[in-house]
C-alpha cells in the first residue's frame, strides 16, 4: 500500500493522531495516540 | 451504501437567499469534511467552501465569503449550504461533496435558478 | 487561493489519437492534483487522484504524470466515448478546479 503525508488542508483532520493518505485507496486515515480511538482518533478511552 | 441526497430544484428571486441540503446515509458526516462545488450552465467546476462537522470548522473561496453560510447538523447526518443576495449569475447547479475518509464522493446535484 | 491554469480549453482530436491536457499550479501542489471526466448533463465523475492514481474500472489509457506545479493529463488512444470536458483540481490547499478542456472528435 502506497503511503504519504496528508495534504495541508487536512491539517486538523486527526484530532489526537497522525493523518497518512493511502493513496491506492483514495483516503485519509488517522494513526491514533495511544488512548484515542475513532476515525478521527476523537474518542479517549481508559 | 454511502450515499449524499441533495434537497430537490429551487426558483429565487433576486436577492433572496436559498439554503440547499445534503443528507448523508451510510457514513458519519463528522467522519469526513463535505464541500461544496458549483457549475453554472455551460460553465466550468467553482469550489464554493467546505465545512469539518466534527469542529464545526469552515473555510471558504475569498469571493464568496460573506455570502456562503455552510452549516452541519449531526444529530440529522446533513449539511447545508446557503447563499444569500443571490444574482442571475448564481444560477447553477450546486453538488455537495464528500471528502477525508474516502476521495470525493459527490451528490447529485441541485439546480438553483435565479429569476426575476 | 492557488490558481490552476489549465490547457487547452478545447481540443479536436481523431480516434486513436493521444491527447494531452497541462495543468499548472501557482504554487507546488505536492502532487495532490485530481482529474474529472464530465459529460453533458452528468455530475463529474473522478478519473485519476494524487496526480496517478487510477480510480477503480477506468480505462488504462488514462493516465496522469507531473510533480511541483506542473501536471499533465493523457488518454493514450482517443475513443469515441471519451467525447467529454476534463478538469483538473488542486487539493493541497483547499481546492481548485481548472478551467476545464473539452474534448472533441475531428
Known amino acids: 500500500v502506497s503511503i504519504t503525508k496528508c495534504n495541508s488542508d487536512m491539517n486538523g483532520y486527526c484530532l489526537h493522531g497522525q493523518c497518512i493518505y493511502l493513496v491506492d485507496m483514495s483516503q485519509n486515515y488517522c494513526r491514533c495516540e495511544v488512548g484515542y480511538t475513532g476515525v478521527r482518533c476523537e474518542h479517549f478511552y481508559l | 451504501q454511502d450515499q449524499l441526497v441533495q434537497s430537490g430544484a429551487e426558483v429565487k428571486k433576486p436577492g433572496a437567499s436559498v439554503k440547499v441540503s445534503c443528507k448523508a446515509s451510510?457514513?458519519?458526516?463528522?467522519?469526513?469534511?463535505i464541500q461544496w462545488v458549483r457549475q453554472a450552465p455551460g460553465q466550468g467546476l467553482e469550489w464554493m467552501g467546505r465545512?469539518?462537522?466534527?469542529?464545526?470548522?469552515?473555510k471558504y473561496r475569498e469571493k464568496f465569503e460573506g455570502r456562503v453560510t455552510i452549516t452541519a447538523d449531526t444529530s440529522t447526518n446533513t449539511a447545508y449550504m446557503e447563499l444569500s443576495s443571490l444574482r442571475s449569475e448564481d444560477t447553477a447547479v450546486y453538488y455537495c461533496?464528500?471528502?477525508?475518509?474516502?476521495?470525493?464522493?459527490w451528490g447529485q446535484g441541485t439546480l438553483v435558478t435565479v429569476s426575476s | 487561493d492557488i490558481q490552476m491554469t489549465q490547457s487547452p480549453s478545447s481540443l479536436s482530436a481523431s480516434v486513436g489519437d493521444r491527447v494531452t491536457i497541462t495543468c499548472k499550479a501557482s504554487?507546488?501542489?505536492?502532487?495532490?492534483i485530481a482529474w474529472y471526466q464530465q459529460k453533458p448533463g452528468q455530475a463529474p465523475r473522478l478519473l485519476i487522484q494524487?496526480?496517478?492514481t487510477l480510480q477503480p474500472g477506468v480505462p488504462s489509457r488514462f493516465s496522469g504524470s507531473g510533480s511541483g506545479t506542473d501536471y499533465t493529463f493523457t488518454i493514450s488512444s482517443l475513443q469515441p466515448e471519451d467525447i467529454a470536458t476534463y478538469y483538473c483540481?488542486?487539493?493541497?490547499?483547499?481546492?481548485?478546479f481548472g478551467g476545464g478542456t473539452k474534448v472533441e472528435i475531428k
Open positions: 461533496v464528500r471528502s477525508g475518509t474516502r476521495f470525493d464522493f
Open positions: 451510510g457514513f458519519n458526516i463528522k467522519d469526513t469534511y
Open positions: 465545512i469539518d462537522p466534527l469542529r464545526r470548522n469552515t
Open positions: 504554487q507546488d501542489i505536492h502532487k495532490y
Open positions: 494524487y496526480t496517478s
Open positions: 483540481l488542486q487539493y493541497d490547499n483547499l481546492r481548485t
